[in-house]
Every structure is written in C-alpha cells, then in structure tokens.
C-alpha cells in the first residue's frame, strides 16, 4: 500500500470527509479525470488539481494534528507528479504564485502574450503536428 | 498572421505593456516555457499560464475598449490549447473555479484524494512506465 493512503485516511477523519454524503452532487476531480485518457490532456487537468491541493494544504500548514499527513502527501505528489524534479516543481510554484491583480504582473503577462500564444499548440515549435491537427486560415 | 497578434498589440497599448522596461527583472512565462520540451511537461506549465490569462481577462470583461481583443484572444486560446474541444474547456473551467476555502469543496477534495493520487504518475494505469522511473517500496 502506498504511504499516502494511510495519511489520506487521517485527513478524511480530520475533514470529516469519510461519510457517504460527501459524494452527493457529483465529484470534483474524479469525473473530470475519467473524461481524459491522453497524457497531455490529463496533465492539463492534473495541473489544476495539484495546484488546488497545494493551496488547500498551505491553508492548513500550521495545524500540527495533520502536519505529518500533509507533508507525506506533498512529498508523494512531488515524486509522482513532478518526477521528484525540483526544477519542475519550482517552475510550477512560480506560475501558481503570480498575482493576477498585480499591475506589473499584468503588464508582463500582456507583454509576453504573443509569444505564449505562439507556443500553445502541441508541437507548434517542432512542426510535428499531424495534418488533422493543423489550423488552416484563408 | 494569426488574428490574436493584432489584438494582443491592442492590449499592449491598453496595459502600457509595450515599453522595454516591462521586461526588467526577467519574464513571467517565457523563461519557464523554455525549460520544458516534453509535451506533458509543457501542458503542466501551460495549464497554469492559460488559467492565469483567463482570470486576467475575467477581471477586464466589462471594459468595452478591449472587449473585442479579449474575446478574439480567448477564442484563439480555445482553438490552440483546447483544440476547439468545448468539453475540455468546460472541465478545465470547472477545475479553475473551485474555491479552496469552501468547506464542502474541501471535504470532497479530501474524499477523492486517494483516487486522485493513484492516477498521478504517467502511465500509472497502463503500466507503461520505464524501468528507470519505477518506484520501489520496502
């Protein structure tokens, strides 16, 4: 059994999240993950899910009763999702921490928009996109 | 020339983001995107970047002078990043809109944590992970 399971069960108790009524009105993440089989699509969704959990854990970082559980799960997420690659985790953290209301950040984001857009399509830089994925313009 | 270019230039004027001083103290997104060549890594980062722009555009949705530009760019992002797939865009939007301070959302997130974690590794379900990437447990 992976180590996160025991710690996640501990968090369930803490958040009172073990009851069947929690599943009422559908799922947050599981239904969405079920929709996407391709690795790149899954990463788009998992990126948002992981950042949600990191934010959630941050809000409870001073709570001693769940600190060990949170640290174990975060470590496990770093191994599994970021492949233990701290540079990947650091870049991800930078992106999640930018404030959308900061004027300097806004200006920079708009300044970089054209180049960001140019890189958005899969294989936009390598020219390896399949014909079926090509965008044709008149 | 892609349609977003003209509209992004319009946004640059609006945000006063065309000056060279905007690039001071490094980039927000471009430096990070440069680090990641693998498609799945790029999607992890681009997912955060796209959600940032959507939040930014939401904050300016009532500003008539840039409404057309924002709409054009959002449409282009949908084509490029979500492959014009509305379901993908909708699932993404759902994830970005969950409130981390909502108690019901917190309980659901913790309730689903074990299953989310089980799916985090690349090819966790398919068993296609390379030997060098295997995780061994005592």
């Amino acid at each position: 059994q992976d180590p996160y399971v025991k710690e996640a069960e501990n968090l369930k108790k803490y958040f009172n999240a073990g009851h069947s009524d929690v599943a009422d009105n559908g799922t947050l993440f599981l239904g969405i993950l079920k929709n996407w089989k391709e690795e790149s699509d899954r990463k788009i969704m998992q990126s948002q899910i992981v950042s949600f959990y990191f934010k959630l854990f941050k809000n409870f970082k001073d709570d001693q009763s769940i600190q060990k559980s949170v640290e174990t799960i975060k470590e496990d997420m770093n191994v599994k999702f970021f492949n233990s690659n701290k540079k990947k985790r650091d870049d991800f953290e930078k992106l999640t921490n930018y404030s959308v209301t900061d004027l300097n950040v806004q200006r920079k984001a708009i300044h970089e928009l054209i180049q960001v857009m140019a890189e958005l399509s899969p294989a936009a830089k390598t020219g390896k996109r399949k014909r079926s994925q090509m965008l044709f313009r008149g | 020339q892609d349609p977003y270019v003209k509209e992004a230039e319009n946004l640059k004027k609006y945000f006063n983001a065309g000056h060279s001083d905007v690039a001071d103290n490094g980039t927000l997104f471009l430096g990070i995107l440069k680090n990641w060549k693998e498609e799945s890594d790029r999607k992890i980062m681009q997912s955060q970047i796209v959600s940032f722009y959507f939040k930014l555009f939401k904050n300016f949705k009532d500003d008539q002078s840039i409404q057309k530009s924002v709409e054009t760019i959002k449409e282009d992002m949908n084509v490029k990043f979500f492959n014009s797939n509305k379901k993908k865009r909708d699932d993404f939007e759902k994830l970005t809109n969950y409130s981390v301070t909502d108690l019901n959302v917190q309980r659901k997130a913790i309730h689903e944590l074990i299953q989310v974690m089980a799916e985090l590794s690349p090819a966790a379900k398919t068993g296609k992970r390379k030997r060098s990437q295997m995780l061994f447990r005592g």
Epitope: V79, S84, K87 | D41, S132, G138
Partner: antibody, heavy 124, light 111 residues
C-alpha cells in the same frame, strides 16, 4: 548542525554481502531524501541509490539495481545500504548525502551535506 | 544513455578566469537543476553551486554557474583564480525519476 556519519565498511570477499549504515542528526530526518554516492579509489563520483523521506520510495542506479537495497528507519534517524554479491569493482568510499525535503518548496539544496564516507574493500 | 561530459583537466594562472563545461548528452539541460562540487584530496565533495547558479553560504562570488540551452551545457566559472582553488570539480544533474547523474570530473591546476 547537520551531520551524517557512515559506518559498517570493511574488507569483504567477492560474493559476500555487507550492510553500511548512516546516522543523521541536526535536522528533521524524516523530511529528507537520502542519497548513497560512492567513489572508487582515484575515480569520480557515482550515484548508487536514493530513498525518499516519509514515503520511503527507493531509486537505484540501473547498473546496481538488484544487488543493492536501500532502506531507512526514521525513528532511529538512520539509513542503510545492503550490498550483496559484492565484486572487486564495488570497492569504494561510500558517502551518505542529504537530499531535498520534497514536502517543502523552499527546501535547502540537494546534496549539500555529505558524510565523510565509509570504505568498502572487496578482495579475496 | 544519459551522460554529463566534462573536460579531464583545466588550468589557469592566479588571478585569471577559467571555465569548466558540462555537456548533457541527451535530454534538455534546462529541465533539471545542475549542481557543482569541489573535491580536494582526502575530503568529501563540497558544493560550490546549486540549482544552476546559486552559491551556498560561505562560497565566494568568484564562483558562478550558468546553463546554456543552445549548447545543452552548464558551466562553472571561477574568476580571480587562487592556489586554494586547485581541486577536482564535478557537475551533477538528474534524469528519469530522481536518478542522480555526475560528470566525470575535471582536475583544475593553478599554474
């Protein structure tokens, strides 16, 4: 002060097994990954294995996997490297090195703190 | 397979600047942090640069690190060379999931 102290090295015969240990102090041991790195006499550095902190995942060099096993006891602040079917080319100084705290985005640098090493000699 | 290639030896006069390169054979050098270690005879390796370009406390600013994606390599630059800098230098990075990789080492001689 962060300290890593290796022990258990010595002279063994080819084909024998040996377990070297590392005791750590001066930091919250269970939070940190621990690496084993070796250095043959007059040669460069070679990564051997890594074990994660609380999750105890094990990572091995492709060339050594199967013969070497890394483990840890967080209560005892200790990490172990069990080596079997030892060969002459396994003769080296074995270093215990502190890794990242992967539960903390502001973790201190990987491989910043090294022990002094324990010498393993494989010879008939 | 994955390799980090360093020159076997580098030399320079006191006060001068030397550069030690570390070329990654496959995968992008920019996708993983690079560290640099100094090892004097009889001592354990000591970090001089971490996470591409940062210096641990106590390391003088004569030591600097950089990464160049176009050549897929990292570099350690030592300026104002001193006799005490004479040592072996190793670069280090990663591949796969937490697989650690060391360069072969470079012997620095101060003439």
């Amino acid at each position: 002060e962060v300290q890593l102290v290796e022990s258990g090295g010595g002279l063994v015969k080819p084909g024998d097994s040996l377990t070297v240990s590392c005791v750590a102090s001066g930091f919250t041991f269970s939070n940190y990954f621990i690496h084993w790195v070796r250095q043959a006499p007059g040669k460069g550095l070679e990564w051997v294995a890594t074990i994660s902190g609380r999750t105890k995942y094990m990572f091995y060099s492709d060339s050594l996997r199967g013969r070497f096993t890394v483990s840890r006891d967080n209560a005892a602040n200790s990490v172990y490297l069990h080596m079997s079917s030892l060969r002459g080319e396994d003769t080296a100084l074995y270093y215990c090195v502190r890794g990242y705290d992967h539960s903390d985005s502001n973790s201190a640098a990987d491989l910043l703190h090294w022990g002094r090493g324990t010498l393993v000699t494989v010879s008939s | 397979n994955f390799m980090l290639t360093q020159p076997l030896s580098v030399s320079g006069y006191p006060g001068k600047t030397i550069v030690i390169s570390c070329v990654r054979s496959s995968g992008s050098v920019a996708s993983h942090y690079v560290q640099w270690f100094q090892q004097r005879p009889g001592s354990a390796p000591a970090m001089v640069i971490y996470e591409d370009s940062h210096r641990p406390s106590g390391i003088p600013d004569r030591f600097s690190g950089s990464v160049d994606a176009s050549s897929n390599s990292a570099s350690l630059t030592i300026s104002g060379l001193k006799t005490e800098d004479e040592a072996d230098y190793f670069c280090q990075s990663y591949y796969g999931n937490n697989q650690v990789l060391f360069g072969g080492g470079t012997k620095l001689t101060v003439l």
